[in-house]
């Protein structure tokens, strides 16, 4: 076994090329210079190495860079990235968006792996915030990325980055996440006119408070039922029948099909039945005529 550590005569690799696919593991270990490998990393992508051979190449890089690979090497890792562990990646300092894109491209089509999650975490922490270009890149590869962040992490998203968000990027966000994103979106889109503003803000409305919904109801926005059903129940409850009618416009007829589902169900329970009847939709379950409605929350506040 001892003599295997020396590179056989004439086998020393002068460049990283396909002749190396004929090398046994021990020959790769002995005959490939790690510094040469580091400078020609891009070539590894183009050579059909076996898994075992890739393990050897990774091991050589690990020995050369025990503190973590430099970005010049990371950018050209190609599918060797799939062999990296989260522990390896935590040692990296990735600052270039091009490097991030190159590695995400390698993982394209896969679920977000622990390696990718670690890479993104390192990158975003290095930048200090989730800027527009980064968010653009991440949501292009992982449409659900934004909704995988905690409300605390989302708080570091600057309002300017919201322009990069597409409706499908918010599909899996829960109300707590939308609570954080909505004020940022409102700020980002504040200078747009009514109809354009509504198109942009619509996906974020799951985080909107009652007063904003009331304001929207005065702008002939014709909100669709799918958006209405994603609104916060506590924000919908104080809306009057007239406000909901204005908010939904021609889509108001869709309330009938949703009358057993939140937030429509809970909203109906808070409305006077004679107000609901004015919609002509046959909505049932409102407060019967003649009943006095006490707002207990207001009473408590007064006492």
């Amino acid at each position: 076994e001892v003599e295997k550590t020396a590179c056989p005569s004439g086998k020393k690799a002068r460049e990283i090329d396909e002749s190396l696919i004929f090398y046994k593991k021990w020959e790769l270990e002995a005959c490939v210079d790690a510094a040469l490998l580091a400078t020609q990393m891009d070539r590894v992508n183009a050579i059909p190495f076996t898994y075992e051979q890739l393990d050897v190449l990774k091991h050589k890089l690990d020995e050369l860079y025990p503190q973590g690979y430099p970005e010049s090497v990371i950018q050209h890792l190609g599918y060797l990235f799939l062999k990296m562990s989260p522990e390896d990646i935590r040692k990296w300092n990735v600052t270039s968006l091009e490097t991030l894109k190159a590695l995400l491209e390698v993982n394209k089509g896969h679920e977000m792996s622990p390696q990718v999650a670690t890479l993104i975490d390192r990158f975003v922490k290095g930048r200090g915030q989730l800027d527009k270009d980064t968010l653009d890149t991440l949501t292009a590869f992982y449409p659900g990325y934004l909704c995988s962040l905690s409300p605390e992490e989302l708080s570091s998203v600057p309002p300017s980055s919201i322009w990069a968000v597409r409706p499908q990027d918010l599909d899996t966000c829960d109300p707590r996440q939308l609570d954080v994103l909505y004020p940022k979106a409102r700020l980002a889109f504040q200078n747009m006119n009514g109809s354009e503003y509504f198109v942009k803000i619509q996906s974020f409305l799951g985080g909107a408070p009652t007063e904003d919904l009331k304001a929207l109801s005065q702008q002939n926005v014709s909100m669709d039922l799918a958006t209405f059903m994603k609104l916060r129940t506590d924000a919908v409850l104080p809306l009057t029948v007239a406000e909901v009618q204005k908010l939904l416009g021609p889509h108001v007829e869709g309330l009938k099909a949703e009358e057993r589902h939140r937030p429509v169900r809970d909203w109906i329970l808070r409305q006077r039945q004679d107000d609901l009847d004015t919609l002509g939709l046959g909505l049932q379950g409102g407060i019967p005529n003649g009943y006095l409605v006490l707002d207990l929350s207001m009473q408590e506040a007064l006492s």
């Epitope: 396909e18 696919i21 004929f22 183009a46 390698v106």
Partner: antibody, heavy 123, light 115 residues
Framework: QVQLEQSGLGLVKPSQTLSLTCAIS??????????WNWIRQSPSRGLEWLGR?????????DYAVSVKGRITINSDTSKNQFSLQLNSVTPEDTAVYYC?????????????WGQGTLVTVSS | QAVLTQPSSLSASPGASASLTCTLR?????????IYWYQQRPGSPPQILLT?????????GSGVPSRFSGSKDASANAGILLISGLQSEDEADYYC?????????FGGGTKVTVL
């Protein structure tokens, strides 16, 4: 002379598993200078590499991203053959499926191919 | 954008030369890739024609005539298959292939018609 003979069902129902086998003559599935591939071809997707298996002191597999999670390639040294299983098929998986040898002396080019099996996914 | 792009068809007269291109996606440098070329006739599997990396590093498939040759055009970031002295039996589909990021990738193929 190396030859590959394919066998397997040509009609599979949606959501079921597609299974094909490739019998090798003139070479061994555990050869350390070859890899054994599955490729498919359809009008919509053209030629598409699905994955490969190879033996280098133990068995390894590489799979295409497009089918990862649905595909398994196994080898059987006693019968000198390898097989493809593709789970949860849809009509999109309708294609002619080929097995092929990659020869390391051709830098793993696929130099020997099976005859092809038309697999139709339909209820 | 596809990794490898080939023109869908090409027509030429018998005896003429045909140059088939295989363009690599921007950002993937043709210089470091070995290009593999396959011929496929109707009803048959593809057959290896040749592999080409450079003039000093190329392989002709077993029994493949020297009329088939490979080259690269670095400025176009493309691999090229040249068929000289075109014959009627050369009418077929031609595919390029590379190993890229852990898997084999094929071009969409070029259908060659001999007029």
């Amino acid at each position: 002379q190396v030859q590959l003979e394919q066998s397997g069902l040509g009609l599979v129902k949606p959501s079921q598993t597609l299974s094909l086998t490739c019998a090798i003559s003139g070479d061994t599935v555990s050869s350390d200078s070859a890899a054994w591939n599955w490729i498919r071809q359809s009008p919509s997707r053209g030629l598409e590499w699905l994955g490969r298996t190879y033996y280098r002191s133990k068995w390894f597999n590489d799979y295409a991203v497009s089918v990862k999670g649905r595909i398994t390639i196994n080898s059987d040294t006693s019968k000198n053959q390898f097989s493809l299983q593709l789970n949860s098929v849809t009509p999109e998986d309708t294609a002619v499926y080929y097995c092929a040898r990659s020869n390391s002396y051709y830098y793993y080019a696929m130099d020997v191919w099976g005859q092809g099996t038309l697999v139709t996914v339909s209820s | 954008q596809a990794v490898l792009t080939q023109p869908s068809s090409l027509s030429a007269s018998p005896g003429a030369s045909a140059s088939l291109t295989c363009t690599l996606r921007s950002g993937i440098n043709v210089g470091i890739y070995r290009i593999y070329w396959y011929q496929q006739r109707p009803g048959s599997p593809p057959q290896i024609l040749l592999t080409y990396k450079s003039d000093s590093d190329k392989y002709q498939g077993s029994g493949v005539p020297s009329r088939f040759s490979g080259s690269k055009d670095a400025s176009a970031n493309a691999g090229i298959l040249l068929i000289s002295g075109l014959q009627s039996e050369d009418e077929a589909d031609y595919y390029c292939m590379i190993w890229h990021s852990g898997g084999w990738v094929f071009g969409g193929g070029t259908k060659v018609t001999v007029l």
